[in-house]
């Protein structure tokens, strides 16, 4: 088994106020086994914003189909962007157990809020 | 409450073809991946074939491979799995069950009983 | 294929463990309870641990290396079944079950 590696490929991402934000993130392996979870934010103040074990998350969708077997996918749209919502979001791969317990995270994708056009 | 009720169970003999659907209701059908499994009389159960939400994507037993095809309609909550080159082990209950974000199974039909017999 | 005991045994209010090995660390194991043949499976335990929302609490599971456990504290008389394990692998994309374990409740 090929070295997890987490590829968020974007530093950054600018969305007006209103709008919907695309954040990228893809896997290279299955394994080990567990869940993505997204964060906006690091350390214990971090906020959850998708965990693909759990839901509903109102206003994230993913943007690939999570339902296939074989998915590495895990982009996500996080509609209705308000101020509130800037930060710097992490992908991050946890492995399974009693809890699950993080394995690896992305460099992370830093969303800014335009003002809403006039 | 999540349902699902499965038809198109029958005697047919061995050589032909048959169609079984599951009818979904109580959840969203089209943000689930779906499958089949069966259960020939006295035995244990067996993982038939799995789809994705979309339907995009399909999945196989090395037992039906070849002879049978699953797929969805999402504008009509139903589920398919078509057989074909019937044979006596084909003989089971077959169910289709909701997978969970692992692609194990939270719910499961009543089942319908194909008999393949000359 | 996993591997489950054929049959286990116990008087009311005992705990009963029954554990299922083979799935090797890629998997996610659960639990499927069928009172009578040919019925409808009940989920009991699905993602290792994860007990439905209308599932009683004196089922629970586990999962360590390759094994799952799955434990019934307190058993019942209505408990009588077949339990069946199930796994998902990653490496092949496949569902696989246990030939099932027969509980009997003296």
């Known amino acids: 088994e090929e070295e997890l590696q987490i590829i968020q490929p974007d530093k950054s991402v600018s969305v007006a106020a209103g709008e919907s934000a695309i954040l990228h993130c893809t896997i290279t392996s299955l394994f080990p086994v567990g869940p993505i979870q997204w964060f906006r934010g690091a350390g214990p103040a971090r906020v959850l914003i998708y965990n693909q074990r759990q839901g509903p998350f109102p206003r994230v969708t993913t943007v690939s189909e999570t339902t296939k077997r074989e998915n590495m996918d895990f982009s996500i749209s996080i509609s209705n962007i308000t101020p509130a919502d800037a930060g710097t979001y992490y992908c991050i791969k946890f492995r399974k157990g009693s809890p699950d317990t993080e394995f690896k995270s992305g460099a992370g994708t830093e969303l800014s809020v335009r003002a809403k056009p006039s | 409450d999540v349902q699902l009720v499965e038809s198109g169970g029958a005697v047919v003999r061995p050589g032909e073809t048959l169609r079984l659907s599951c009818t979904a209701s109580?959840?969203?059908?089209?943000?689930?991946?779906m499958s089949w499994v069966r259960q020939a009389p006295g035995k244990g159960l067996e993982w038939v074939s799995g789809?994705?939400?979309?339907?995009?994507?399909?999945y196989y037993a090395d037992s039906v491979k070849g002879r049978s095809t699953i797929s969805r309609d999402n504008s009509k909550n139903t589920l398919y799995l078509r057989m074909s080159s019937l044979t006596a082990e084909d003989t089971a209950v077959y169910y289709c069950?909701?997978?969970?974000?692992?692609?194990?199974?939270?719910?499961w039909g009543l089942g319908t009983l194909v008999t393949v017999s000359s | 294929a996993l591997t489950q005991p054929a049959s286990v045994s116990a008087n009311p209010g005992e705990t009963v463990k029954i554990t299922c090995s083979g799935g090797?660390?890629?998997?996610?194991y659960g639990w499927y309870q069928q009172k009578s043949p040919g019925s409808a499976p009940v989920t009991l335990i699905?993602?290792?641990?994860k007990r439905p929302s209308d599932i009683p609490s004196r089922f629970s599971g586990s999962a360590s290396g390759s094994t799952a456990t799955l434990t019934i504290t307190g058993v019942q008389v209505e408990d009588e079944a077949v339990y069946y394990c199930?796994?998902?692998?990653?490496?092949?994309?496949?569902?696989?079950f246990g030939a099932g374990t027969t509980l009997t409740v003296l």
């Open positions: 069950a909701r997978e969970t974000w692992n692609h194990l199974f939270d719910y």
């Open positions: 109580g959840f969203t059908f089209s943000s689930y991946a």
């Open positions: 789809i994705s939400a979309s339907g995009s994507d399909t």
């Open positions: 090797g660390t890629s998997s996610y």
């Open positions: 699905h993602s290792d641990d």
């Open positions: 199930g796994g998902y692998d990653y490496t092949t994309y496949v569902n696989t």
